[in-house]
Amino acid sequence: TQHGIRLPLRSGLGGAPLGLRLPRETDEEPEEPGRRGSFVEMVDNLRGKSGQGYYVEMTVGSPPQTLNILVDTGSSNFAVGAAPHPFLHRYYQRQLSSTYRDLRKGVYVPYTQGKWEGELGTDLVSIPHGPNVTVRANIAAITESDKFFINGSNWEGILGLAYAEIARPDDSLEPFFDSLVKQTHVPNLFSLQLCGAGFPLNQSEVLASVGGSMIIGGIDHSLYTGSLWYTPIRREWYYEVIIVRVEINGQDLKMDCKEYNYDKSIVDSGTTNLRLPKKVFEAAVKSIKAASSTEKFPDGFWLGEQLVCWQAGTTPWNIFPVISLYLMGEVTNQSFRITILPQQYLRPVEDVATSQDDCYKFAISQSSTGTVMGAVIMEGFYVVFDRARKRIGFAVSACHVHDEFRTAAVEGPFVTLDMEDCGYNIPQTDESTLMT
């Protein structure tokens, strides 16, 4: 988990599909009641921006203490600031909660850069703009941290929505969503619509603007266009998926598909960028550079260090290619593709001294821990985390940023053989060899 890249770390038109579309079987199967339709009370319940994370309002304790909590599908702890910190406007005060229970256990979470540590306990938790339920959940009360909280981000904690396998200190600490499903009738599914602004937001604009929606327990039709296409969750730890092909402006990168998933591919709302394994990153950048060769940008731009600026309103989106990721489908030998625009992978940033320029950072970066489909990917799509059926759905987001010529797309089906071979099997430590 890297700070600045991984947070903390860590109106759309549907595209016409190429090839034959399955008869909407991925979108119209019978579902459990309450999982589909309108969730008005949860729409627009997220705020924030891709560079600093999207957060939801939650309440903790009795009487309820209101906090803004980063929505993170790349971790599994519910952890909140519980001591004064220069970047926190407010924090969880356990001593004021009559329902707080101390678990008498510490937790320490180091990142590549930075860390947080705290004390474990449980308390009553609810989501004001979520399902009308209260659950007793595990909470890590953060007492010390380094490079975790972000100045001006307006969130005070993190909601890890992934599986128990990656919870700290170990998988016996039940994650929040597991507790929610176990203690209520909320279906085992949530969906995210992250809405990138397409331009930099200052502090007051972030507070006033809508950042998107987290629909807990269902799917809201108003948040997407076209069909939902599902990819299997390969293993329940991170939200791990399998990428089977990558194209830049329709040109296949032609790599062994194992490279795309080395050592895993995950969907992570707590990461800003699309992060790619070294070899894949180098090939992708080479291809993007070639496609946009009418302009020469500094090497530092492609490494995420330098900005590129145009005079306001003159960004030549058309010189940058679209990027397509093909994901394993639910049917044998069938895949589908999700396509993002430069409006997703060029991240708008505030210029240091002038509002005359539109400036951008290249939001694709190199990874040593596999592919991370972060906010820049998710901002193009409505993403359904269907835990009950062990699958993740993608549809074109109704709020994705695009222009009059191109739109993000989710298209299929495509015939792809031997997709199972694209998954990388991380070597498991043989416990017996440690017993010497």
Partner: nanobody, 129 residues
Framework: QVQLQESGGGTVQAGGSLRLSCAAS????????MGWFRQAPGKEREEVAS??????????AASVKGRFTSSQDNANNTVTVYLQMNSLKPEDTAIYYC????????????????????WGQGTQVTVSS
């Protein structure tokens, strides 16, 4: 407008050292990104080092890593960047240019080359065998 002036070039024997300097004035932003480039006769210009003031980081081309080091001085509204070149080889012979981006941003409409808006005149480095 950022002004760049290189100095320190010359002729040196293989294995010898030279120190180039680039004085930059006229920055409008606190942060800056600068690059050292070189161009040998009949070859394309290549970046040999780049400096990012915000990150306090320097990157080097593989061909010079371990032999060239860059450092910087900030005084009196002028930034001076140095390129210390050790263990020089005949293939290091080229015109060396200093380039800069104000605010660590390449402003496309200002023009420039190789992703930099501002360029010095260049200084000749010749390494004889």
């Amino acid at each position: 407008q950022v002004q760049l002036q290189e100095s320190g070039g010359g002729t040196v024997q293989a294995g010898g050292s030279l120190r180039l300097s680039c004085a930059a004035s006229g920055y409008t932003y606190r942060s800056y990104c600068m690059g050292w480039f070189r161009q040998a006769p009949g070859k394309e210009r290549e970046e040999v080092a780049s400096i990012n003031s915000d990150q306090g980081s320097t990157r080097y081309a593989a061909s010079v890593k371990g032999r060239f080091t860059s450092s910087q001085d900030n005084a009196n509204n002028t930034v001076t960047v140095y390129l210390q070149m050790n263990s020089l080889k005949p293939e290091d012979t080229a015109i060396y240019y200093c380039a800069a981006n104000d605010g660590c941003a390449y402003r496309v409409y200002r023009g420039g080359a190789y992703g930099y808006n501002f360029w010095g005149q260049g200084t000749q480095v010749t390494v004889s065998s």
